[in-house]
């Protein structure tokens, strides 16, 4: 059912990393327009995007209010023009997305090695805790405000001269690893959640490499 | 259900090549580290090395680096195990495991290879 | 690379005994410390995770401590079926090191 002219919207997909949440849709319009809704399973619908003419909508200021919430979104569409118009059923055409939990379901961003500091053969690797739009207090939290213990790092590393590469784990941001007097190493990190079974890594963060640049060196 | 199903073991001779494989169910492998670990008979049990599938980044315990190889098909759900110019002493049973980040949840059952002329 | 010292390589108790595996890293593995148990021709099974989390469905009388070099495995109240060997590793860094394991049989 639906008004001429006017398709319901699909491929409803949330994309959504270090909880900046966006709902992306199918169809590109042609003389119609969307509107979408959200709501918790418990919770009221709230309308965003009016009447757009975008297959996106940021919706990071709804979830970000609890991320431990499942939400459901829904896509209206209209008919361009006369956005009051309803379907057959005496309501204008819809669809629903799957559900949502950010918690559980946002991607971890890429990390980015903040620093490494070397006091003799021993090295300190350090991930920058990063930033998220997640608000308490009107504060921004970090991922690490967010998930706590939850979130764990994974250190691969090896030295400059060689291929072979190892690994060290930590939940802190932190490494301390033992590295070989007057080698220099190179460093790359994941972000990981253990206890999810989907979207538990990140992509590894950017190579650094002693030598260059980011590190302080003391004997 | 989670499984793991090791297979391509069996007897070879020494400085021949066999490659094993670990057919995943249950979930992909590409969100998760891969290990093979091994067992001599009436041996402990000894790690070879991991893989993270979603990149193809490997490490190895070095006494193995160069010799054997571990390699993924994410389209397969497969991990694989590359082991040349074998030894003896390379005789165990060979198991893949899966890594959690905390511990190794879920194990193969397990394939025995034999290296003997 | 870690080295991880096992003891005792071998132990006999009777039923209700509690048993005490202990497990010494040579450097701090900042508790990335598992207990595995093995039966005869069967792949290993976990235990105790995170050296002191006990793994779902594994009974009450497992438990684990330590930390920084020094690891210990116990079973409270030693039951027939706790027959196996038992093993330690440490995955905080690689290489990842595994105990040289603890036959535990029964007197």
């Known amino acids: 059912s639906g008004t001429t002219n006017t398709v319901a919207a699909y491929n409803l997909t949330w994309k959504s990393t270090n909880f900046k949440t966006i709902l992306e849709w199918e169809p590109k319009p042609v003389n119609q327009v969307y509107t979408v809704q959200i709501s918790t399973k418990s919770g009221d619908w709230k309308s965003k995007c009016f009447y757009t003419t975008d297959t996106e909508c940021d919706l990071t200021d709804e979830i970000v209010k609890d991320v431990k919430q499942t939400y459901l979104a829904r896509v209206f569409s209209y008919p361009a023009g006369n956005v009051e118009s309803t379907g057959s059923a005496g309501e204008p055409l819809y669809e629903n997305s799957p559900e949502f939990t950010p918690y559980l379901e946002t991607n971890l961003g890429q990390p980015t090695i903040q620093s490494f500091e070397q006091v003799g053969t021993k090295v300190n690797v350090t991930v920058e805790d990063e930033r998220t739009l997640v608000r308490r207090n009107n504060t921004f939290l970090s991922l690490r405000d967010v998930f706590g213990n939850d979130l764990g790092y994974i250190l691969t590393y090896r030295k400059s001269s060689s291929s072979g590469k190892k690994t060290a784990k930590t939940n802190t941001n932190e490494f301390l690893i033992d590295v070989d007097k007057g080698e220099n190493y190179c460093f790359s990190v994941q972000a990981v959640i253990p206890s999810r079974t989907v979207n538990r890594k990140s992509t590894d963060s950017p190579v650094e490499c002693m030598g260059q640049e980011k590190g302080e060196f003391r004997e | 259900q989670v499984q793991l199903v090791e297979s391509g073991g069996g007897v070879v001779q020494p400085g021949r090549s066999l490659r094993l494989s670990c057919k995943a169910s249950g979930f992909n492998i590409k969100d998760y580290y891969m290990h093979w670990v091994r067992q001599a008979p009436g041996k402990g049990l000894e790690w070879i090395g991991l893989?993270?599938?979603?990149?193809?980044?490997?490490i190895y315990d070095p006494k193995f680096q160069g010799r054997f190889t571990i390699s993924a098909d994410n389209s397969k759900n497969t991990l694989f195990l590359q082991m040349d110019s074998l030894r003896p002493e390379d005789t165990a049973v060979y198991y893949c495991?899966?890594?959690?980040?905390?511990?190794?949840?879920?194990w193969g059952q397990g394939t025995p290879v034999t290296v003997s002329s | 690379d870690i080295q991880m010292t096992q003891s005792p390589s071998s132990l006999s108790a009777s039923v209700g005994d509690r048993v005490t595996i202990t497990c010494k890293a040579s450097q701090d593995i900042r508790k990335y410390l598992n207990w595995y148990q093995q039966k005869p021709g069967k792949a290993p099974k976990l235990l105790i995770y995170?050296?002191?989390s006990l793994a779902d469905g594994v009974p009450s009388r497992f438990s684990g401590s330590g930390s920084g070099t020094d690891y210990t495995f116990t079973i409270s109240s030693l039951q027939p079926e706790d027959i196996a060997t038992y093993y330690c590793l440490q995955h905080g860094e690689s290489p990842y090191t595994f105990g040289q394991g603890t036959k535990l049989e029964i007197t």
């Open positions: 995170y050296a002191t």
């Open positions: 893989i993270d599938p979603e990149n193809g980044n490997t």
């Open positions: 495991a899966r890594d959690n980040s905390y511990y190794f949840d879920y």
